[in-house]
Interface confidence: medium
Amino acid sequence: CKAMHVAQPAVVLASSRGIASFVCEYASPGKATEVRVTVLRQADSQVTEVCAATYMMGNELTFLDDSICTGTSSGNQVNLTIQGLRAMDTGLYICKVELMYPPPYYLGIGNGTQIYVIDPEPCPDSDF
């Protein structure tokens, strides 16, 4: 296993609809044909997997149909979007990139993107 640098933004604010997007960029040392991207969430020292996708270079990124993540890939950049977020989902979202094939296997883990989610205020009842 060889190390690889992964960069991602420090902070992202989710939209009022609970959608957050960020770019995960990796410094590919070789010509990988298969790349695996995993988003991990760290909160209160607990790390959980949010979503994962394996894709082929030159092809688009596809997560499983029931995933809360969507994404596109371009070169060594992966544009990730996480949907359905609520205030309780605020936390550090870490991008993990693996160059799966061909060997050697490379692993890179970003420093994480702190995603802040603010639940929208309910609309006040209107007399009109």
Epitope: T54, Y55, N59
Partner: nanobody
């Protein structure tokens, strides 16, 4: 776990055609990418063509316009239609499946292009 079984290889003359098939079984719901790789005698594995669950395809330059990858989700089968075959296409062709936690290889099928 996913199992992949290729078929359709054989001996063909230059300029001829072959159609490879790869039948997937097991945890196929978790597959979102499928591809064909090949290994020519004395060479390393090469990605020939890939297709994702939305039908987006990509090809190595040397086969563009000659090979077509397709996927029939109802039959859980991947295909590679190979036309205008050349001697340099001689190789063992391997099916590849990728997904959330899936990374499976087929056992390979030999394609020999010779007169």
């Amino acid at each position: 776990e996913v199992q992949l079984l290729e078929s359709g290889g054989g001996l063909v003359q230059p300029g001829g055609s072959l159609r490879l098939s790869c039948a997937a079984s097991g945890s196929i719901f978790s597959i979102n990418h499928m591809a064909w790789y090949r290994q020519a005698p004395g060479k390393g594995l090469e990605l020939v063509a890939g297709v994702n669950s939305r039908g987006t395809t990509n090809y190595v330059d040397s086969v563009k316009g000659r090979f077509t990858i397709s996927r029939d989700n109802s039959k859980n089968t991947l295909y590679l239609q190979m036309n205008s075959l050349r001697a340099e296409d001689t190789a063992v062709y391997y099916c590849r499946a990728l997904g959330g936690a899936v990374a499976a290889w087929g056992q390979g099928t030999l394609v020999t292009v010779s007169s």
